[in-house]
């Protein structure tokens, strides 16, 4: 057993070396180890074949180190590995696409808070057993096509707290088992109409705190199992373009947050869900007809990116404008700083407690959020609780199979990984 470690055999052969100030993966780790705990050290590099002798390894924790480099063959030979935690290694920045190849039994992969700027092609190839993938709190700007294609058993995908600006058509291809998709606190301004095509089992979708002014209902149509939808803290444009989303929300039987309007000005702060259909009139084209807020591509129906309902009609040119407002009015969305670079709610009207990811119940109090940050280990962000509360409900004994949403979700527990010290 390496000097800084404790090794024991029951109930699993374990080599435990946490918080020992180690600067390298120790030599002499028993080959029979099933669990290796190396978290909280000063390890900066994982060389090739570091654990090759440990054929029985099922759990490897390397979180909260100072990893800057992981050799592509670092995890070679770990065919039985089930849980790999590399989180809280902010200097990592990138991972060689071959790093996880051969980890056919891996079911949990923690890559949160690793400073990742991109997901290389084929990074998750062959991880057919993966169920939980933690990619939150990185610096990801894009979701390349087919990144998750092999992850047919993935149930939880955490992508929040990144810099993702759009959700392309093939971003989530192959995720047929996905139950929870957390995309909040990004910079998403556009969701492709077919982005969620494979997500027929998705139950929870968080898109709050992004840059969405519109959302094609075609994107939501495949989400047959959806129960929890959070769309608050986005610069929603509540004009004729929002009618399909409004209609979809009226029919939605699950739980959804408020969808506070940003434009037109007369509806700013109002909840789209509670508007009447005839509130959604005209078009809030605030920067002139050639610079619409609408970000969709030009099509036959949408020349210049203007949706059909906004196109000037010879009979009624005024219909494309919000009634009573000039076309040159200042665009309230212009210069909106993406989430993460500004205080919560910046650019989307006053932020009330009903902007919590869980919405608000009718009539509940709405004091403004404080800017106070809780204990040091917690990143600033959005609360876990929301609608306040149905007292006296019966006790539930729900297990978070691994990760329970409810902090966002806890039939009693926490999930995921990252808040290290």
């Amino acid at each position: 057993c390496p000097g800084a470690c404790v090794c024991y055999n029951e109930p699993k052969v374990t080599t435990s070396c946490p918080q020992q100030g180690l600067q390298a993966v120790p030599v002499g780790i028993p080959a029979a180890s099933q669990r290796i705990f190396l978290h909280g050290n000063r390890i900066s590099h994982v060389p090739a074949a570091s654990f090759r002798a440990c054929r029985n390894l099922t759990i490897l924790w390397l979180h909260s180190n100072v990893l800057a480099r992981i050799d592509a063959a670092a995890f070679t030979g770990l065919a039985l590995l089930e849980q790999l935690d590399l989180s809280d290694n902010a200097q990592l920045r990138s991972v060689d696409p071959a790093t996880f190849h051969g980890l056919g039994r891996l079911h949990t992969l923690h890559l949160d808070r690793c400073g990742l700027q991109e997901l290389g092609p084929g990074l998750f190839r062959g991880l057919a057993a993966l169920q939980y993938l933690y990619l939150q709190d990185n610096a990801l700007q894009a979701l390349p096509d087919d990144t998750f294609r092999d992850l047919g058993n993935l149930t939880h995908l955490f992508l929040h707290g990144n810099r993702i600006s759009s959700v392309p058509e093939r971003a989530f291809r192959g995720l047929h088992s996905l139950d929870r998709l957390l995309l909040h606190q990004n910079r998403v301004a556009h969701v492709h109409p077919h982005a969620f095509r494979d997500l027929g089992r998705l139950m929870t979708l968080y898109l709050f705190a992004n840059n969405l002014s519109a959302l094609p209902t075609e994107a939501l149509a495949p989400l047959r199992a959806l129960q929890y939808l959070r769309l608050n803290d986005n610069p929603w444009v509540c004009d004729c373009r929002a009618r399909p989303l409004w209609a979809w929300l009226q029919k939605f039987r699950g739980s959804s947050s408020e969808v506070p309007c940003s434009l037109p000005q007369r509806l700013a702060g109002r909840d789209l869900k509670r508007l009447a259909a005839n509130d959604l009139q005209g078009c809030a084209v605030a920067t002139g007809p050639y610079h619409p807020i609408w970000t969709g591509r030009a099509t036959d129906e949408e020349p210049l990116g203007l949706p059909k309902c906004c196109q000037p009609d010879a009979a009624d040119k005024a219909s494309v404008l919000e009634p009573g407002r000039p076309a040159s009015a200042g665009n309230a969305l212009k210069g909106r700083v993406p989430p993460g670079d500004s205080p919560p709610g910046n650019g989307s009207g006053p932020r009330h407690i009903n902007d919590s990811p869980f919405g608000t119940l009718p009539g509940s109090a709405e004091p403004p959020l404080t800017a106070v940050r809780p204990e040091g280990s917690e990143p600033p962000g959005f609360p876990t609780s929301g609608p306040r509360r149905r007292p006296g409900c019966s006790r539930k004994n729900r297990t978070r199979s691994h990760c329970r949403l409810g902090q966002a979700g806890s039939g009693g527990g926490g999930t995921g990984d990252s808040e290290g010290s």
Partner: antibody
Framework: QMQLVQSGAEVKKPGASVKVSCKVS????????IHWVRQAPGKGLEWMGG????????VYAQKFQGRVTLTDDTSTDTAYMELSSLRSEDTAVYYC??????????????????WGRGTMITVSS | DIQMTQSPSSVSASVGDRVTITCRAS??????LAWYQQKPGKAPKLLIY???RLQSGVPLRFSGSGSGTDFTLTINSLQPEDSATYYC?????????FGQGTRLEIK
């Protein structure tokens, strides 16, 4: 800095009820998940119940079901724990605690990160 | 309900020693376990959550590890102020349950 400030000690007679308050400062109650834990003299910690944000409901330990009620007043950022039909074995220090579970970081780590100082409830005839 | 069993129930050690407390769950709780320290007359204080995550402000001599059903809290280089009772708690589901506690005394 966030704090949980609890109401003062009380002495109650068997069969009576008691209502303990827990005022949140430095945060709004609506942002938090508050739980209640008690500790009888010389004994260990016992979870009584708390708020489960996923299901937007309050959950209770079976042992206290029907006798304990957890409520909130969001206008004053105060959580309450009411225990009825008191008996001598309910003599304990009652703590409110804030669940770490935080939506950011996907890590809904559910552990009690901040505690009130406790409220001593003595049940005696 | 998930039962949590701590051992030993009490331990006595000297300043500078390394102390290990174990906690066993009656069923698999993955890594969803927290450790608390409680001193007489005070509220408990969170040390570690998610089995191995050190809470902000907790000295590095405290570390946690384990997954599934067996977990350990290790205190390296014991200090006089570490005299307290230590509790584990499973955070995997409701009802949240605590271990019975381990009393640590400094010789």
């Amino acid at each position: 800095q966030m704090q949980l400030v609890q109401s003062g000690a009380e002495v109650k007679k068997p069969g009576a009820s008691v209502k303990v308050s827990c005022k949140v400062s430095g945060y709004t109650l609506s942002e938090l998940s508050i739980h209640w834990v008690r500790q009888a003299p010389g004994k260990g910690l016992e979870w009584m119940g708390g708020f489960d944000p996923e299901d937007d409901e309050t959950v209770y330990a079976q042992k206290f079901q029907g006798r304990v009620t957890l409520t909130d007043d969001t206008s004053t950022d105060t959580a309450y724990m009411e225990l009825s039909s008191l008996r001598s074995e309910d003599t304990a220090v009652y703590y409110c605690a804030r669940d770490l579970g935080y939506l950011t970081s996907g890590n809904y780590y559910n552990a009690f990160g901040i505690w009130g100082r406790g409220t001593m409830i003595t049940v005696s005839s | 309900d998930i039962q949590m069993t701590q051992s030993p129930s009490s331990v006595s050690a000297s300043v500078g020693d390394r102390v290990t407390i174990t906690c066993r769950a009656s069923q698999d709780i993955n890594r969803w376990l927290a450790w608390y320290q409680q001193k007489p007359g005070k509220a408990p204080k969170l040390l570690i959550y998610a089995a191995s995550r050190l809470q902000s402000g907790v000295p590095l001599r405290f570390s946690g590890s384990g997954s599934g059903t067996d977990f350990t809290l290790t205190i390296n280089s014991l200090q006089p102020e570490d005299s307290a009772t230590y509790y584990c708690q499973q955070t995997n589901n409701f009802p949240r349950t605590f271990g019975q506690g381990t009393r640590l005394e400094i010789k």
